[in-house]
């Protein structure tokens, strides 16, 4: 059978803005059979150790690349070439590596993301944060005073749900339980740091008890170089 | 309407722990965006806070006192619990419980009425 | 930390006067527009109450003769008229950046 891809939700992510000095990981799970080989290319050329410094990891049981400490010369294209003697499949990932300087909060792209849930039900927003700095993190609801959200003076009215603290092990997580209609409406995750501030939002459905949420669910997966984001200082 | 109590033991010796209680009710620590927080006062000072817990079991500490400072709930309860350990005479003040504004987490809108603590050498 | 800076420390005022107390941050405690800067009274022997959240709101149940205003770093409290029941220990407090802080106090007495 010719190569296939079994993971594609870990390949949707094309494009990699990572911090130098970071660690970062492709993978390009598949399977085949026989079982397929894979090797890599960096710009359509056939990537080697020697290419740099510290050269690369391949796991092949994993289907992953591995740099470590990585730094602006590996920005590029790299692509993975899946093969077997029936066929073969690739998929290229692009990466562009960001000199680390004091820069605003950088929040990922599409968290915290639109959730649904019934009355009564839980739901979590995430907000994945990179920060040199140490960042601050507030999470803000748009609310209604009065039928109306807006004051008299033309700001929303919002209110603070929860801050992050120094060392807060949750703050990138608002957790909301035995939701009500009121619950439902605008989140917002708001970072700064004592450069600048980012802020994302997302919304809240609360459906009736006898209606199931769709699949419009709060997404957690994050890339590898954000783990550890509160160690940047 | 909300009402706050605090409790604790009143006076006790250096080094040891020191153990509060505020029992509350009015409202429920399980609401999303409700949060108590510790405040405390030695006497003819200022306010300064310790910390505070939020509905989903969240912690923020003062971060002078953090490696001393447990703050824990027990929603049904309706209780909060702050833990001092290895206390000093300058940890005499009157402690205070106090949950959050509807606006903020960190708005004291309803205050208990304080417990005061003794700590003797 | 924001460091919040109350002044005067004490301030002694005639009956039907205006009082005015000044609370200074270390940085900007405005967000969205929002300054969170809120003012609380102390009386001996009572726990803190809330007057005054977000800069320029009463809260429910307080006189109209408490206003506050400013913005940014700078912000007032004012009393006026002052009554006797005035006469107490009035703090600022933020709760833009995590720890939320207090000012020193501001003792208002009646002159």
């Known amino acids: 059978r010719a190569p296939y891809w079994t993971n594609t939700e870990k390949m949707e992510k094309r494009l990699h803005a990572v911090p130098a000095a970071n660690t970062v990981k492709f993978r390009c799970p598949a399977g085949g059979n026989p079982m397929p080989t894979m090797r890599w290319l960096k710009n359509g050329k056939e990537f080697k150790q020697e290419h740099r410094i510290g050269g690369y990891k391949v796991r092949n049981q994993h289907w992953s690349l591995i740099m470590e400490s990585v730094v602006p010369s590996d920005k590029g294209n790299y692509t993975c070439v899946v093969e077997n003697e029936y066929g073969s499949i690739n998929h290229t990932y692009h990466l562009d590596v960001v000199e680390r300087s004091p820069h605003r909060p950088i929040l990922q792209a599409g968290l915290p993301a639109n959730a649904s849930t019934v009355v009564g039900g839980d739901v979590e927003f995430v907000c994945k944060v990179y920060s040199d700095a140490q960042p601050h993190i507030q999470w803000i609801k748009h609310v209604e005073k009065n039928g109306s959200k807006y004051g008299p003076d033309g700001l929303p009215y919002l209110k603070v749900l929860k801050h992050s603290g120094i060392n807060s092990s949750n703050a990138e997580v608002l957790a909301l339980f035995n939701v009500t209609e009121a619950d439902a409406g605008e989140y917002i995750c708001k970072v700064s740091n004592y450069i600048g501030q980012a802020n994302q939002s997302a919304w809240l459905t609360v459906l009736p008890k006898q209606q199931a949420p769709g699949r419009e669910k709060e997404i957690t997966a994050s890339p590898d170089y954000l783990e550890h984001h509160h160690h940047h200082h | 309407q909300v009402t706050l109590k605090e409790s604790g033991p009143g006076i006790l010796q250096s080094s040891q722990t020191l153990s509060l209680t505020c029992s509350f009710s009015g409202f429920s620590l399980s609401t999303s965006g409700m949060g108590v927080s510790w405040i405390r006062q030695p006497s003819g000072k200022g306010l300064e806070w310790l910390a505070h817990?939020?509905?989903?079991?969240?912690?923020r500490y003062n971060s002078s006192l953090k490696s001393r400072l447990t703050i824990s709930k027990d929603t049904s309860r309706n209780q909060v619990f702050l833990k001092i350990t290895s206390v000093d005479t300058a940890d005499t003040a009157t402690y205070y419980c106090?949950?959050?504004?509807?606006?903020?987490?960190?708005?004291?809108?309803?205050w208990g009425q304080g417990t005061s603590v003794t700590v003797s050498s | 930390d924001i460091v919040l800076t109350q002044s005067p420390a004490s301030l002694a005022v005639s009956l039907g006067q205006r009082a005015t107390i000044s609370c200074r941050a270390s940085e900007s405690i405005d967000d969205f527009g929002i300054s969170f800067m809120h003012w609380y009274q102390q009386k001996p022997g009572q726990p803190p109450k809330l007057l005054i959240y977000r800069a320029s709101n009463l809260e429910s149940g307080i006189p109209a003769r408490f206003s506050g205003s400013g913005s940014r770093a700078d912000f007032t409290l004012t009393i006026n008229p002052v009554e006797t029941d005035d006469v107490a220990t009035y703090y600022c407090?933020?709760?833009?950046?995590?720890?939320?802080?207090f000012g020193a106090g501001t003792n208002l007495e009646l002159k």
């Open positions: 817990i939020y509905w989903d079991d969240d912690k």
């Open positions: 106090a949950r959050s504004s509807d606006w903020d987490d960190y708005t004291m809108a309803y």
């Open positions: 407090q933020q709760s833009n950046k995590d720890p939320p802080t």
